[in-house]
């Protein structure tokens, strides 16, 4: 083993370096000293370090480590934060457009129901927005409230426009009759199923993204232990005490130190992997009735169909409700007038397939692909940090924490550390409390994601009994029940091409193309064209 190079006789180099860390040179010895008070950079001979310098090095080493960790996670953090913002805004835009489409449908087809319908539609979509953002609202209650509110207006304005004002105090009775007589057929149930499934998935997707941000933020701001600070000081700064300013730590030694320092953080790895894979599974299932964009943008059509259903049954309904709500005190006897033959043949409920332009769904898949490139983020952290801090290539002529060596040997390094700080002890301490907390949160979200992810093949399951749908409710496949009625089947074209230009856009190069090409098909299925009308104005 070669003898160490002679220390700087005047500690001049050390002084000039330390000046950058700590202005004022009172702690730096003029010439090498025995250094018997040192606790980390234990000297083999005279040293240019003092106890105060050692403390400053430890502080700097821990700060360096925090900065390295933050820069390591910067790209991942940016990816999730931006996507969470993009999707949150995108979902809000979908809700606003769905509300506009529904209002337009009422205005074009049922002008006598506006402005009351606008009010009820507005309240419904406000609840939808709140639900997506985590509010404790029951989706079935939202849908029931919409139909409960609409029916009295439909009854008094469409079915019985000549009702005298004195008869208008029957609203409560009409609200009750709406459910008892199933006046909208199975449409409310259909909408409940679609909306609850799609919104649940949307909500959990946003929750998962926000938790991803929390995970990164937690590990990003970890405070490293004093033990770790000592190890880092020994690796990065103790060589300076011997005047070895240009020497770099051995790569193998860096890996050992980083694994020790990051033992707790690396424990997140297993749950992080599961998080990304579970999120991928959820995203893969987000289509048809599990895709809120698809469901909400087609909702106006289903509501239109439900009103047509009422109109087709107006004769029977008017008679029944006339008896039922003639006097509000008769309300408790509603069930006695329940007509057996009220329901229309379910075969009339035809399906309109939704033309679905790839926008939000392709954006989600793009996010998953990018996230998957970070699947080993936590297990790879020690190596990443070493590769982004100065280390000697090929482990030759490098610093092993005690001296300059020609080749790094982990065994030799361990032997040389016998009297010093023990790496094994550091690993045994277990993760920081904040890391344990974040692991618990990851476990919880992973469980939720697994619960929400549809098993393979479930999305197209033909057996709908568990949903309470009778065969024939809506074609053969509940997942295709997006609406559509007899004559002019209403088709919806996804209008969210603007997503590519959202203010938060991740990277312009990766944004989905904002293709403006309109084929004849585009014109046929423009969203606003057929909001209930079979004739399109732009032909």
């Amino acid at each position: 083993q070669p003898p160490p190079p002679p220390p700087d006789a005047t500690c001049h180099q050390v002084r000039s370096f330390f000046q950058r860390l700590q202005p004022g040179l009172k702690w730096v010895p003029e010439t090498p000293v025995p250094g018997s008070d040192l606790q980390v950079c234990l000297p083999k001979g005279p040293t240019c370090c003092s106890r105060k310098m050692e403390e400053k090095y430890q502080l700097t080493a821990r700060l360096n480590m925090e900065q390295l960790l933050q820069s390591a996670s910067m790209e991942l953090k940016f990816l999730i934060i931006q996507n969470a913002a993009v999707f949150q805004e995108a979902f809000e835009i979908v809700v606003r457009h769905a509300k506009n489409y529904t209002n337009a449908m009422f205005k074009n087809n049922y002008p006598s129901l506006t402005p009351q319908a606008f009010e009820f539609v507005g309240e419904f979509f406000t609840d939808v927005s709140l639900y997506i953002l985590g509010s404790d609202i029951n989706v079935d209650d939202m849908v029931n409230e919409l139909f409960d509110s609409l029916f009295p207006v439909i009854y008094t304005q469409l079915m019985n426009p000549g009702l005298p004002d004195s008869a208008l105090d029957i609203n409560e009775c009409l609200r009750g009759a709406r459910r008892d007589l199933k006046v909208f057929g199975n449409f409310p149930k259909l909408i409940m199923t679609q909306v609850s499934k799609s919104l649940q998935v949307t909500r959990i997707f946003l929750q998962a993204l926000n938790l991803g941000i929390e995970v990164i933020n937690t590990t990003d701001h970890l405070k490293f232990s004093k033990d770790c600070g000592r190890m880092l000081t020994r690796m990065w700064y103790c060589s300076y005490c011997q005047g070895l300013m240009m020497v770099k730590p051995c790569g193998g030694y860096c890996n050992v130190v980083m694994q020790g320092c990051m033992a707790g953080v690396v424990e997140i790895d297993k749950y992080w992997r599961e998080y990304i894979l579970s999120l991928e599974e959820l995203v893969n299932g987000m289509y048809r009735i599990y895709d809120m964009e698809n469901v909400l943008l087609g909702l106006f059509s289903t509501i239109h169909d439900s009103i047509q259903y009422v109109q087709k049954n107006a004769g029977k309904l008017t008679t029944t409700i006339g008896k039922l709500c003639a006097h509000s005190q008769q309300r408790q006897y509603r069930s006695a007038y329940y007509p057996e033959d009220l329901f229309i043949d379910k075969k009339v409920l035809k399906v309109a397939h939704v033309e679905h332009e790839e926008t939000l769904s392709s954006r989600r898949r793009e996010l998953i692909q990018k996230l998957k490139s970070f699947i080993s983020f936590y297990s790879a952290l020690p190596g990443y940090i070493c590769s982004h801090s100065p280390v000697a290539e090929n482990d030759t002529l490098c610093w092993n924490g005690q001296e300059l060596v020609e080749r790094y040997s982990q065994k030799a390094a361990r032997n040389g550390m016998k009297n010093q700080f023990n790496l094994h002890e550091l690993k045994m301490k277990g993760p920081e409390p904040v890391v344990s907390q974040i692991i618990d949160k990851l476990k919880h979200i992973n469980q939720l994601l697994r619960t929400m992810s549809m098993p393979k093949g479930r999305v197209l399951d033909k057996n709908l009994d568990e949903e309470g749908f009778e065969s024939g409710d809506c074609g053969d496949d509940e997942d295709e029940c997006i609406g559509g009625s007899g004559d002019g089947m209403i088709k919806v074209k996804n209008q969210l091409r603007f997503l590519a230009e959202l203010a938060y856009d991740l990277d312009v190069d990766d944004a989905p193309g904002n293709s403006q090409q309109a084929t004849p098909k585009d014109n046929e299925i423009s969203t606003f064209h057929n909001l209930g009308n079979v004739h399109s104005p732009l032909k």
């Epitope: 809000e92 457009h97 509300k99 002008p111 606003f528 009308n533 104005p537």
Partner: antibody
């Protein structure tokens, strides 16, 4: 293809009532709203109001007190009346088919001049 | 009431791309429609629902809408595109039609 043909008096004195009619040819009348829009010389478009086949109207608040839009479904026509006109009402008046939320087809326009 | 703001004029060389903006509070939440008006003629709908074209309108006309700005883009501009362009929204909260002030497109 739907066509909108409009006509009415082109020269009015202040305080008189502007009266225009628009006839709809070659398309459904009942499925849409029908609108009036005006454009003062060298200026932008201003929405006046709308009506549907059942007579349901909706007006621009700034003109509401002076505007009446009516419909005659038997003739597939709708009309605009604007009372107490002043020089500020000088404009080209357009009728249009309004398929909420846009105006898909327009009449040729009628220049109405208010001058004493 | 809802207000739409357009630049009074935009100039562009033939063959280049013209972009006409329409600003409004959270306009991205609304459907935006664009009309072209040539001197002495009635307006013609060129883009509806942010980005769709009626039949007969060239593919050179496209639209986008996000945040507080909607944009009408005319690529490979021709002399015949010189006209006034108006944006329009339906403000469903007031149930009124609202127009922007218009933008004069000059082809240099």
């Amino acid at each position: 293809q739907v066509q909108l043909q409009q006509w009415g008096a082109g020269l009015l004195k202040p305080s008189e009532t502007l009266s225009l009619t628009c006839a709809v040819y070659g398309g459904s009348f009942s499925g849409y709203y029908w609108s009036w829009i005006r454009q003062p010389p060298g200026k932008g478009l201003e929405w006046i109001g709308e009506i549907n086949h059942s007579g349901s109207t909706n007006y621009n608040p700034s003109l509401k007190s002076r505007v009446t839009i009516s419909v005659d479904t038997s003739k597939n026509q709708f009309s605009l009346k604007l009372s107490s006109v002043t020089a500020a009402d000088t404009a080209v008046y357009y009728c249009a088919r309004y398929y909420v939320p846009y105006l898909s087809d327009w009449g040729q326009g009628t220049l109405v001049t208010v001058s004493s | 009431s809802y207000v739409l703001t357009q630049p009074p004029s935009v100039s562009v060389a033939p063959g280049k791309t013209a972009r006409i903006t329409c600003g409004g509070d959270n306009i991205g939440y609304k459907g935006v429609h664009w009309y072209q008006q040539k001197p002495g003629q009635a307006p013609v709908l060129v883009v509806y629902d942010d980005s769709d074209r009626p039949s007969g309108i060239p593919e050179r006309f496209s639209g986008s809408n996000s945040g507080n700005t909607a944009t009408l883009t005319i690529s490979r501009v021709e002399a015949g595109d010189e006209a006034d362009y108006y944006c329009q929204v339906w403000d469903s909260s007031s149930d009124h039609v609202v127009f922007g002030g218009g933008t004069k497109l000059t082809v240099l």
